[in-house]
């Protein structure tokens, strides 16, 4: 039961953190005008990855796309590039997710099998979580820089009459939204591994038994099911102990009361 | 077709309050950002109020800060502006006028006039 | 607050004739986020109220007669009458619409001969 909620809820979780980052991804305020010198403001400027926006206050606003790739700073590409890898990751640890749930029956499909995929949906969410808060963390250090950089200038070269007005950016909504989203993919992505521990056909614990056979002693060791060798394929492996362990036959013949059809 | 028709002004006297409206027509007042401008007798043009679309924002010039209150009744769609503690340096035409385009006014209506006077 | 500043204050021409005013603003009226200059040129015949001719420095409105061209960035801007009429007699106004106070400058008054 706990291993089906873990389970749900990773992917719950890392639902929303995509969802999240394609959100942040396509918003168009990673930075915005700084206000603090000036708060009444009537002209209102805004970027994104994809387009700047400049909102006027007679509620006009206009967005202009960036219709150039080599034009643009290598930074803004890198962050472009990371958003959009996160989004694919996640995009694919979902589809991956979904047949992995364990309330989800496809088939005869296997635990290990549930168990390989909630492990790679998991490491996938992970890695798109670090995609976007990367990305994100890469855009605000640049903000921060640029940001510390434009100050500078605003104090230099005032001596003559005339003043230019130095537009500074700071954080925007997406960037928030951003680190919140990878966030919670990567704390999605974490559960799923964690579930996957649950989910695997764990080793199932045998007393060590001595068989006597034809004057040779063989030592059984525990988890030697598995791999069944030495077994005619008639033989039933019989419960040496009643401890909760099922023989293979009874794992296969009953199902849990977890799984929903 | 846009209308804009300023009523309310009159002869006050120094101190006095006064309350100007704007009656809208030909579009939905809520959906613009409206101001109001003045015109002193010496000809100056000086912006005095504006009130940003869905009213949450209204701006002021520090001449008339804490004196004069900008505000819109959608229902009515009219403007209004409350002048208050009115000195003889308020004396002007008084015109409402809604914003386009790049903050220009595109559209005033034809201004009511307002004498602060002993 | 961005002071706003005229020439000349009147100018009296001849019909036909190019006319130029020039309006200096204190402060830098471009935006960088649009690349667009924030500055708005009007026209006030008199008893009228008055009448909106160009913003974005070079953007004509509406309306307005192609003879009218404004241009100019950054701090220096001039509105252009290319060949001035008769129905021109007016005052000329700019107005800074890039930072609150939004302020105005003293007016060109175009007379005609």
């Known amino acids: 039961m706990a291993v089906t909620a873990c389970q749900g809820l990773g992917f719950v979780v890392s639902l929303i953190g995509i969802a999240g980052i394609i959100a942040a991804t396509c918003m168009d305020q990673w930075s915005t005008q700084d206000l603090y010198n000036n708060p009444v403001t009537a002209v209102f400027n805004y970027q994104g990855l994809w387009r700047s926006c400049v909102r006027e206050s007679s509620g006009f606003t206009e967005c202009r796309g960036y219709f150039t790739l080599l034009g643009l700073p290598a930074m803004l590409q890198a962050v472009r590039a990371l958003m959009i890898v996160g989004i694919v990751l996640g995009a694919i640890g979902l589809l991956v997710s979904i047949f992995a749930l364990k309330c989800i029956r496809i088939g005869s499909m296997e635990d290990s099998a549930k168990a390989n995929m909630t492990l790679t949906s998991g490491i996938m969410f992970i890695v798109s979580g670090l995609c976007a808060i990367a990305g994100v963390s890469v855009f605000a250090n640049m903000l921060v820089t640029n940001f510390w950089m434009s100050t500078a200038n605003m104090y230099t070269g005032m001596g003559g009459m005339v003043q230019t007005v130095q537009t500074r950016y700071t954080f925007g909504a997406a960037l928030f939204v951003g680190w919140v989203a990878g966030g919670l993919t990567l704390i999605g992505g974490v559960m799923m591994c964690i579930a996957c521990r649950g989910l695997a056909p764990e080793e199932t614990n045998y007393k060590a038994v001595s068989y006597h056979a034809s004057g040779h002693s063989v030592a059984y060791k525990p988890g030697g099911f598995k791999a069944s060798t030495g077994f005619g394929s008639n033989t039933k492996n019989k419960k040496i102990y009643d401890g909760g362990a099922r023989t293979e036959d009874e794992v296969q013949s009953y199902p849990s009361k977890h799984d929903y059809v | 077709e846009v209308m804009l028709v300023e009523s309310g002004g009159g002869i006050v006297k120094p101190g006095g309050s006064l309350k100007l409206s704007c009656a809208a027509s030909?579009?939905?007042?809520?959906?613009?950002?409206m101001s109001w401008v003045r015109q002193t007798p010496e000809r100056r043009l000086e912006w005095v109020a504006t009130?940003?679309?869905?009213?949450?924002?209204?701006y002021y010039p520090d001449s008339v800060k804490g004196r004069f209150t900008i505000s819109r009744d959608n229902a009515k769609n009219t403007l209004y502006l409350q002048m208050s503690s009115l000195r003889s340096e308020d004396t002007a035409m008084y015109y409402c006028?809604?914003?386009?385009?790049?903050?220009?006014?595109?559209?005033w209506g034809q201004g009511t006039l307002v004498t602060v006077s002993a | 607050d961005i002071v706003m500043t005229q020439s000349p204050s009147s100018l009296t021409v001849t019909a036909g004739e190019k006319v130029t005013m020039s309006c200096k603003s204190s402060?830098?009226?471009?935006?960088?986020?649009?690349?667009?200059?924030?500055l708005t040129w009007y026209q006030q015949k008199p008893g009228q109220p008055p009448k909106l001719l160009i913003y974005?420095?070079?953007t004509r409105e509406s309306g307005v007669p192609d003879r009218f061209t404004g241009s100019g960035s950054g701090t220096d801007f001039t509105l252009t009458i290319s060949s001035v009429q008769a129905e021109d007699l007016a005052v000329y106004y700019c107005?800074?619409?890039?930072?609150?106070?939004?302020?105005f400058g003293s007016g060109t008054k175009l007379e005609i001969k």
């Open positions: 006028a809604r914003q386009g385009y790049g903050n220009s006014f595109p559209y």
């Open positions: 402060q830098s009226l471009l935006n960088s986020g649009n690349q667009k200059n924030y």
């Open positions: 009130i940003i679309i869905g009213g949450s924002y209204t």
């Open positions: 107005q800074n619409d890039y930072s609150y106070p939004f302020t």
């Open positions: 030909g579009f939905t007042l809520s959906s613009y950002t």
């Open positions: 974005w420095a070079s």
